[in-house]
């Protein structure tokens, strides 16, 4: 273990007005999963709905790059490669945990938060509004 | 802010042996997400590889729930209806961290892991293997 | 097992392009999981990373500040190798360059696997 | 650009005895981005930790990592006649941010 050196200004443990804070020890277990995960194999490649992933970076948050998926077409891929428009190609989206530094610059003061990703891309049917 | 309860044997912030350990705040903010998302609306319906949600609940876990997609089919719905199984319905996986409890029961005292969810399905052209 | 097996020369004349080869075996240049770089090492600079490359349904292109203006990395997909071009050369660019897998699993960043290493010197 | 400085240059021990190997950064930098190699005369480096504490794999249990924000320590808890080499941390900030230390020689006393 290490002693944690206390930086001016960061807040410490024992401040009973410290909001909602816990102790969190940063050595991540893998659970269900390799060290080195084939993310998704290559189906934005094979999908009926591809996409595109594009890096998301930002050195203050972990995890720093994550990789978002944008869909390539508005409609969906047929079987002879051209795009079918009477279907719909939608991202697949999903909130994850990141942390970020707060106060930023505190080595050992974090701050959890919630965002909203695109995993990949989806075919569905659309949704047709009848006006009467 | 609230005073944080002592469980004996939970570790507590001034332990110097408590390994990596650093200060969380769970007020968490919610970036470009609202805090109940309509989980990617009901694509698991209307996708030509629809799948199903299974609620994964671990009371030692934050978050306590999390839906797993489990694909509905092998193969992908074709407009009428009826299964193709020359094309295959496949999860698409994305590596997530969330908060356990450690020790267990511990009401303010967290590991990180990392966890494989699917978070929803999408329709792929199968890569076949030919045989010499 | 992966491995990494580096060629080219060993002597490039100043103001000329520096040349070397990265084949990958056990392991696809394309991996969505990984990313392919070089790193050299001098007495004088110690280790210095170069660049990457990396495959997220495009190439990515990733070169360090110092050497941004002279550097290339390219995949060859057919042979499942990537190459380094150092553009310009000086005498301060001899070193022994290493090319290496970097695990790029969104959560970690590290260099798991290295090439032998070859040492490039940079005279007339 | 995060400068790491490691400390000592040089550690002169006894086979036995413990190495305590310290690597400090300019400014914080994510432990989960930051690894430890091994690197001994003619030969390139060795991964030994990755994310400041976790060992690579075949890394034997005498090898441990620990530190978070700017200051991250390597420790040999009992040193074996082939751990003698140069030791170096390196960081990852950003996709154009990544350096490495000048290193740590570990040699025999």
């Known amino acids: 273990g290490i002693a944690i050196p206390r930086n001016s200004g960061c807040p410490n443990s024992e401040d009973k007005n410290f909001p909602r804070t816990v102790m969190v020890n940063l050595n991540i277990h893998n659970r269900n999963t390799s060290t080195n995960p084939k993310r998704s194999s290559d189906y934005y490649n094979r999908s009926t709905s591809p996409w595109n992933l594009h890096r998301n970076e930002d050195p203050e948050r972990y995890p720093s790059v994550i990789w978002e998926a944008k869909c390539r077409h508005l409609g969906c891929v047929k079987a002879d490669g051209n795009v079918d428009y009477h279907m719909n190609s939608v991202p697949i989206q999903q909130e994850i945990l990141v942390l970020r530094r707060e106060p930023r610059h505190c080595p050992n003061s974090f701050r959890l938060e919630k965002i909203l990703v695109s995993v990949g891309c989806t075919c569905v049917t659309p949704i047709v509004h009848h006006v009467a | 802010g609230i005073a944080i309860p002592r469980n004996s044997g939970c570790p507590n912030s001034e332990d110097k042996n408590f390994p990596r350990t650093v200060m969380v705040n769970l007020n968490i903010h919610n970036r470009n997400t609202s805090t109940n998302p309509k989980r990617s609306s009901d694509y698991y319906n209307r996708s030509t590889s629809p799948w199903n949600l299974h609620r994964n609940e671990d009371p030692e876990r934050y978050p306590s729930v999390i839906w797993e997609a489990k694909c509905r089919h092998l193969g992908c719905v074709k407009a009428d209806g009826n299964v193709d199984y020359h094309m295959n319905s496949v999860p698409i996986q994305q590596e997530i961290l969330v908060l356990r409890r450690e020790p267990r029961h511990c009401p303010n005292s967290f590991r990180l892991e990392k966890i494989l969810v699917s978070v929803g399905c999408t329709c792929v052209t199968p890569i076949v293997h030919h045989v010499a | 097992q992966v491995q990494l097996q580096q060629s080219g020369p060993g002597l490039v004349k100043p103001s000329q392009t520096l040349s070397l080869t990265c084949a990958i075996s056990?392991?696809?240049?394309?991996?969505?999981?990984?990313?392919w770089g070089w790193i050299r090492q001098s007495p004088s600079r110690g280790l210095e990373w170069l660049g990457r490359?990396?495959?997220?349904?495009?190439?990515?292109?990733d070169y360090a500040v110092s050497v941004k203006s002279r550097i290339t990395i390219n995949p060859d997909t057919s042979k499942n190798q990537f190459s380094l071009q150092l553009n310009s050369v000086t005498p301060e660019d001899t070193a022994v360059y290493y090319c290496?897998?970097?695990?790029?699993?969104?959560?970690?960043?590290?260099?798991?696997?290295w090439g032998q290493g070859t040492l490039v010197t940079v005279s007339s | 650009e995060i400068v790491l400085t490691q400390s000592p240059a040089t550690l002169s021990l006894s086979p036995g005895e413990r190495a305590t190997l310290s690597c400090r950064a300019s400014?914080?930098?994510?432990?989960?981005?930051l690894a430890w190699y091994q690197q001994k005369p003619g030969q390139a480096p060795r991964l030994l930790i990755y994310?400041?504490?976790n060992r690579a794999t075949g890394i034997p249990a005498r090898f441990s990592g620990s530190g978070s924000g700017t200051d991250f320590t390597l420790t040999i808890s009992s040193l074996e006649p082939e751990d003698f080499a140069v030791y170096y941390c390196q960081q990852y900030r950003s996709t154009l941010s990544l350096t490495f230390g000048q290193g740590t020689k570990v040699e025999i006393k």
């Open positions: 400014q914080n930098v994510w432990a989960f981005y």
């Open positions: 994310g400041a504490s």
């Open positions: 290496a897998r970097e695990v790029d699993s969104m959560y970690y960043s590290y260099f798991d696997i």
């Open positions: 056990g392991d696809s240049v394309s991996s969505s999981s990984a990313a």
């Open positions: 490359i990396s495959y997220r349904s495009k190439w990515y292109n």
